[in-house]
C-alpha cells in the first residue's frame, strides 16, 4: 500500500521540498503534539458495562516502542446487578495507527512504515443470532 | 530515543537510538488495509452505546481520510430500546500516530503526527453524588 | 469537590414560562454532559434535558420536546433550561445532573409549580 502522491490540482510542488531518493520518503520522527496533554475520561475501562483491560506490548526495534493493547474482560456484559449478562456480548473496538520499524540486514538499517491495529477498548452489543437447521 | 540490540560484528558507527529523521520505504508494511469502520463491522449500530461515523478529510495528512465516532444519545439503550439516561454512552478516545507533510505540499517528506481519535463509544455505570 | 447552584424554580399558571440555571464550580473539568431530571410526587426521576459538553448536542425527553430548550454557557460552566408553554403535569422537583462520564453530580433540586 503505498502513500499516494499529492495529486490535487491546487497543489503546487514547492521549490522548497527535500530532496528523495527514488522509491523512499523522508520522514521526521519529531512528534507534533507529543508533550500535548489530553483529558481521558478517568477509569472507563473499570466502569464500562463492557469493561477491559490493559497490556504494554514493547518492541526497542519499533517506534514508538510502547504499544498499550486493551483486552475484554468478559465475554458478556455487566449487567445493573453487577452480574456478567451472556446474553450479550462484551467485542473489542480497534483502531489502526501508524509505527516506524527498523529492520536489520546484515549491518545495514533500513526504516519501513507499519500499519498495526490498536484495541482501544470494548462495547457492549447485541449479537446476531442465527438457529442452524 | 529507544536502545535497541545491536549485532556485535557490525563497525560501532551505528546510532542506537532511532535518528530524528529517517528515509522510509514508501510501501507500508500493513495486512489491515480496511480502513472503513463501516465496512469492517456493525458494532456502531448494535452496541448498547450506539454511535455515527464522521469522515475527517485532510490531503496533507496520511492517511488523508480518519473516520471519528460521535456517541449517539448521552444514555444507553436498554433492553427495551429506549434510552437510560442513568448510564452514560462515553467515547473512547486514542491516541494515534499519522503522517503530515512537511514542508507543506511536498509529495515525499513528511513528520509523525500524534492525533486524539474517538474510536467508538462504550456504556459506562457512573458513581453517583448527591451534591449537598 | 464540585458544586451545583440550581435557580429559577416557582409558581407558575398553566401556558407560562419559566428559566432554571445551574452553575458548577469546583472540580467541574472534563463534563461528558449537564442536564435536568425531574421528580414528580409520587413518581420516578425522570430525564428531561440534557446537553453534551464537547458538541453541544441536545437530547429531550419526548414529553418536553419542542416546549424546553437547554443551553449553556461554557466560560461559566452554566447550564440554562427554558422552559415554555408550561403544564400542570410539568410540576415536580428539577434536579440539575453534571456528568464526568464515570462520576455523576446531582444537584439538591428546584421546585417547579404549574397550577391556575
Known amino acids: 500500500r503505498k502513500i499516494p502522491k499529492v495529486g490535487h490540482t491546487f497543489f503546487q510542488k514547492p521549490e522548497s521540498c527535500p530532496p528523495v531518493p527514488g522509491g523512499s520518503m523522508k520522514l521526521d520522527i519529531g512528534i507534533i503534539n507529543e508533550n500535548q496533554r489530553v483529558s481521558m475520561s478517568r477509569n472507563i475501562e473499570s466502569r464500562s458495562t463492557s469493561p477491559w483491560n490493559y497490556t504494554v506490548t514493547w518492541d526497542p526495534n519499533r517506534y514508538p516502542s510502547e504499544v498499550v493493547q486493551a483486552q475484554c474482560r468478559n465475554l458478556g456484559c455487566i449487567n445493573a446487578q453487577g452480574k456478567e449478562d451472556i446474553s450479550m456480548n462484551s467485542v473489542p473496538i480497534q483502531q489502526e495507527t501508524l509505527v516506524v520499524r527498523r529492520k536489520h540486514q546484515g549491518c545495514s538499517v533500513s526504516f519501513q512504515l507499519e500499519k498495526v491495529l490498536v484495541t482501544v477498548g470494548c462495547t457492549c452489543v447485541t449479537p446476531v443470532i442465527h438457529h442452524v437447521q | 530515543g529507544i536502545t535497541i540490540p545491536r549485532n556485535p560484528g557490525c563497525p560501532n558507527s551505528e546510532d542506537k537510538n532511532f535518528p530524528r529523521t529517517v528515509m522510509v520505504n514508501l510501501n507500508i508494511h500493513n495486512r489491515n488495509t480496511n480502513t472503513n469502520p463501516k465496512r469492517s463491522s456493525d458494532y456502531y449500530n448494535r452496541s448498547t452505546s450506539p454511535w455515527n461515523l464522521h469522515r475527517n478529510e485532510d490531503p496533507e495528512r496520511y492517511p488523508s481520510v480518519i473516520w471519528e465516532a460521535k456517541c449517539r444519545h448521552l444514555g444507553c439503550i436498554n433492553a427495551d430500546g429506549n434510552v437510560d439516561y442513568h448510564m452514560n454512552s462515553v467515547p473512547i478516545q486514542q491516541e494515534i500516530l499519522v503522517l503530515r507533510r512537511e514542508p507543506p505540499h511536498c509529495p515525499n517528506s513528511f513528520r509523525l503526527e500524534k492525533i486524539l481519535v474517538s474510536v467508538g463509544c462504550t456504556c459506562v455505570t457512573p458513581i453517583v453524588h448527591h451534591v449537598a | 469537590e464540585v458544586q451545583l447552584v440550581e435557580s429559577g424554580g416557582g409558581s407558575v399558571q398553566p401556558g407560562d414560562s419559566l428559566r432554571l440555571s445551574c452553575a458548577a464550580s469546583?472540580?467541574?473539568?472534563?463534563?461528558?454532559?449537564f442536564g435536568w431530571f425531574r421528580q414528580a410526587p409520587g413518581k420516578e426521576r425522570e430525564f428531561v434535558a440534557g446537553i453534551r459538553w464537547s458538541d453541544a448536542y441536545t437530547e429531550y425527553a419526548n414529553s418536553v420536546k419542542g416546549r424546553f430548550t437547554i443551553s449553556r454557557d461554557n466560560s461559566k460552566n452554566t447550564v440554562y433550561l427554558q422552559m415554555d408553554s408550561l403544564r400542570p403535569e410539568d410540576t415536580a422537583v428539577y434536579y440539575c445532573?453534571?456528568?464526568?462520564?464515570?462520576?455523576?453530580?446531582w444537584g439538591q433540586g428546584t421546585l417547579v409549580t404549574v397550577s391556575s
Open positions: 445532573v453534571l456528568d464526568l462520564s464515570t462520576v455523576r453530580y
Open positions: 469546583g472540580r467541574a473539568n472534563s463534563i461528558n454532559w
